[in-house]
Amino acid sequence: TERLCHPCPWEWTFFQGNCYFMSNSQRNWHDSITACKEVGAQLVVIKSAEEQNFLQLQSSRSNRFTWMGLSDLNQEGTWQWVDGSPLLPSFKQYWNRGEPNNVGEEDCAEFSGNGWNDDKCNLAKFWICKKSAASCSRDEEQFLSPAPATPNPPPAGSGGGLNDIFEAQKIEWHEHHHHHH
């Protein structure tokens, strides 16, 4: 078959030079960070209004509460992304009305409805990982068989524990070591 460049691992979504993995199982915030690290990614850090709109849409479409890589665990009231960068004032508009309210030690941020909410970090929620898309140069063996750029996610709750992350890892390894024909 025709060999095409597929910039993201299977079941990851490409958007503006990055790949996003929307989980189908749920973990607490810290374990979500670990899950993303296990696949060479990071719990999502939002860098632009376009990226925010894209991710918010993904989350609201699936009607899921979804962790992002933002918390005020280091200093109460000072929100910081997991890459160490601060939450800029122009991004504070994305908090839902009345949030962040820190009711009962809510130190981690999630996509909730049409905006952001702070919630308890030990609660299990879906999560989104982000990493740079492949360059697709021939030298790096990134030419792969046709695949949907944005595959339909399995129904909510269909992911079994760590299965979706392990599958993503296997698929990612496979894509980096094989050509599909």
Epitope: G17, K47, A49, E50, G77, L88, P89
Partner: antibody, heavy 119, light 106 residues
Framework: QVTLRESGPALVKPTQTLTLTCTFS??????????VSWIRQPPGKALEWLAL???????YYSTSLKTRLTISKDTSKNQLVLTMTNMDPVDTATYYC???????????WGQGTLVTVSS | DIQMTQSPSTLSASVGDRVTITCRAS??????LAWYQQKPGKAPKLLIY???SLESGVPSRFSGSGSGTEFTLTISSLQPDDFATYYC????????FGQGTKVEIK
């Protein structure tokens, strides 16, 4: 109407600390979405953003200058203070304070104050 | 940090000319861009915000366009009062200004 006015020394010696004050009116820094920033412009050169403080009292600094800068506010006096340590002749510039609309663009500016660093 | 590159650095034009200034961002900034006009000895003045929104009181001959990484400021018919230096500024990640474009009399 919204006004901002910078004040501080016109001349500073090398290695000294510069303290600038911005006095503003027509808005409150405790109102959601309000931010005030410091921006400088060396003679004949481009604008350079230095620091910003927002309504939550969160502070943001230029990556290249953050070890030398401190920004603070006195909401009751409608004042903003910037301190810059270890001044050098290359820091000679006009220093502006400006309101940042929701932490984005600068819609109101002070007239600026020229600070010369020389021994 | 995001770098902003303006072109040209200097632009010679005559009254009545259509003038276009370009600003490029080193990474995507959505439409989070503003344009300012500055005259010698004066503070900058906001012209355009969010790439294409005209600030209140700014003449309609000024317009802005673009999204992502490439933006333009257009003056449809240059007036004597428009000879000045123009700066773009991004506010997607911290705050960065371009190096400026001086519009001078031809």
């Amino acid at each position: 109407q919204v006004t901002l006015r910078e004040s501080g020394p016109a001349l500073v010696k090398p290695t000294q600390t510069l303290t600038l004050t911005c006095t503003f009116s027509g808005f409150s820094l405790s109102t959601g979405g309000m931010c005030v920033s410091w921006i400088r412009q060396p003679p004949g050169k481009a604008l350079e953003w230095l620091a910003l403080i927002d309504w939550d009292d969160d502070k943001y600094y230029s990556t290249s200058l953050k070890t030398r800068l401190t920004i603070s506010k006195d909401t009751s006096k409608n004042q903003l203070v910037l301190t810059m340590t270890n001044m050098d002749p290359v820091d000679t510039a006009t220093y502006y304070c400006a309101r940042a609309h929701s932490g984005s663009y600068f819609d109101f500016w002070g007239q600026g104050t020229l600070v010369t660093v020389s021994s | 940090d995001i770098q902003m590159t303006q072109s040209p650095s200097t632009l010679s034009a005559s009254v009545g000319d259509r003038v276009t200034i370009t600003c490029r961002a080193s990474q995507r900034i959505s439409n989070w861009l503003a344009w300012y006009q500055q005259k010698p000895g004066k503070a900058p003045k906001l012209l355009i915000y969010k790439a294409s929104s005209l600030e209140s009181g700014v003449p309609s001959r000024f317009s802005g366009s673009g999204s992502g990484t490439e933006f333009t400021l257009t003056i449809s018919s240059l007036q004597p009062d428009d000879f000045a230096t123009y700066y773009c500024q991004q506010f997607n990640s911290y705050w960065t200004f371009g190096q400026g474009t001086k519009v001078e009399i031809k």
